[in-house]
């Protein structure tokens, strides 16, 4: 989780801080959304369970050319213990369901806020 505070971060970031920062970034995305997020791109829906961070990254990494979610992609990579590349899929994807990035972000945000409230940071 060392890199989650951004490039200016002086050292390791506590998991609770890292999760709060990810939540705040997702809040920022949802609040600043004017045109359809990522031009209405569709991504695979995921099961919001253990391993969710990698699954979320695997879904979002397939969206290219969308600057609005680049920071989110970087932050999610800090929560995922392995390297994720485009076209990679885990069993956590609901492979028959695609949703808009905006809905994906909204669902992820809701879940992460509850994890934060419950003290589940990893």
């Amino acid at each position: 989780l060392t890199c989650l505070g951004g490039f200016a971060s002086p050292g390791p970031v506590p998991p609770s801080t890292a999760l709060r920062e990810l939540i705040e970034e997702l809040v920022n995305i949802t609040q600043n959304q004017k045109a359809p997020l990522c031009n209405g791109s569709m991504v695979w829906s995921i099961n919001l369970t253990a391993g969710m961070y990698c699954a979320a990254l695997e879904s979002l990494i397939n969206v290219s050319g969308c600057s609005a979610i680049e920071k989110t992609q970087r932050m999610l990579s800090g929560f995922c213990p392995h390297k994720v590349s485009a076209g990679q899929f885990s069993s956590l994807h609901v492979r028959d369901t695609k949703i808009e990035v905006a809905q994906f972000v909204k669902d992820l945000l809701l879940h992460l806020k509850k994890l934060f409230r419950e003290g589940q940071f990893n």
Epitope: S16, L19, R20, L110, K113, K114, E118, G119, F121
Partner: antibody, heavy 120, light 112 residues
Framework: EVQLVESGGGLVQPGGSLRLSCAAS????????IHWVRQAPGKGLEWVAR????????KYDPKFQGRFTISRDNAKNSAYLQMNSLRAEDTAVYYC?????????????WGQGTLVTVSS | DIQMTQSPSSLSASVGDRVTITCRSS???????????LEWYQQKPGKAPKLLIY???NRFSGVPSRFSGSGSGTDFTLTISSLQPEDFATYYC?????????FGGGTKVEIK
């Protein structure tokens, strides 16, 4: 307008069962947590249980676990409290409340309460 | 379970008085996420409780500025700087940091 309305209270004999309902409007229960809090006549408030309607993550005060069951029906935007093996000391006004929708920091809306009387 | 002990259990005061209610938790109520989920609720007879203060010292929207909260660790205080007629009620502290969540026993503020 956000509203919570409890129903299902009434007179029940010791050992009996009752199912309380909490009907929500003005928001989606999946976006927050729903809690049950009770208050015996002339006594203080007592937290009973909480449910996350998005995933059925449930927590109880251990003193109620086993006898009370919290549940939800997202299609009806409602939560429930099933109370079994009722005792005289369960006589109370039962409130449902929701956690606020931003960071879930506090209870911002409560129902009006429903009175449960356990007596023979 | 965390016990929340409120004092006094009741008090008599006059309009304009400064009123202080204390709440002590049996152990720290700092959540693992760094927040302290300590709230104060006001309840009038036959009515549902109403939130006054959350996370120790944050006034809920619409709550008059005469209500303030303070404290840390295990000791918390609700202060009403100048008691108004509508403030005669029962006040409860509440910890939402550790399951099972718990309320204090309440402080009834009565007219002297």
């Amino acid at each position: 307008e956000v509203q919570l309305v409890e129903s299902g209270g009434g007179l029940v004999q010791p050992g009996g069962s009752l199912r309380l309902s909490c009907a929500a409007s003005g928001f989606n229960i999946k976006d927050t947590y729903i809690h049950w809090v009770r208050q015996a006549p002339g006594k203080g408030l007592e937290w009973v249980a909480r449910i996350d309607p998005a995933n059925d993550n449930i927590k109880y005060d251990p003193k109620f676990q086993g006898r009370f069951t919290i549940s939800r029906d997202n299609a009806k935007n409602s939560a429930y409290l099933q109370m079994n093996s009722l005792r005289a000391e369960d006589t109370a006004v039962y409130y449902c409340a929701r956690s606020e929708e931003n960071w879930y920091d506090f209870f911002d809306y409560w129902g009006q309460g429903t009175l449960v009387t356990v007596s023979s | 379970d965390i016990q929340m002990t409120q004092s006094p259990s009741s008090l008599s005061a006059s309009v304009g008085d400064r009123v202080t209610i204390t709440c002590r938790s049996s152990q720290s109520i700092v959540h693992s996420n760094g927040n302290t989920y300590l709230e104060w609720y006001q309840q009038k007879p036959g009515k549902a409780p109403k939130l006054l203060i959350y996370k120790v010292s944050n006034r809920f929207s619409g709550v008059p500025s005469r209500f303030s909260g303070s404290g840390s660790g295990t000791d918390f205080t609700l202060t009403i700087s100048s008691l108004q007629p509508e403030d005669f009620a029962t006040y409860y502290c509440f910890q939402g940091s550790h399951i099972p969540y718990t309320f204090g026993g309440g402080t009834k503020v009565e007219i002297k």
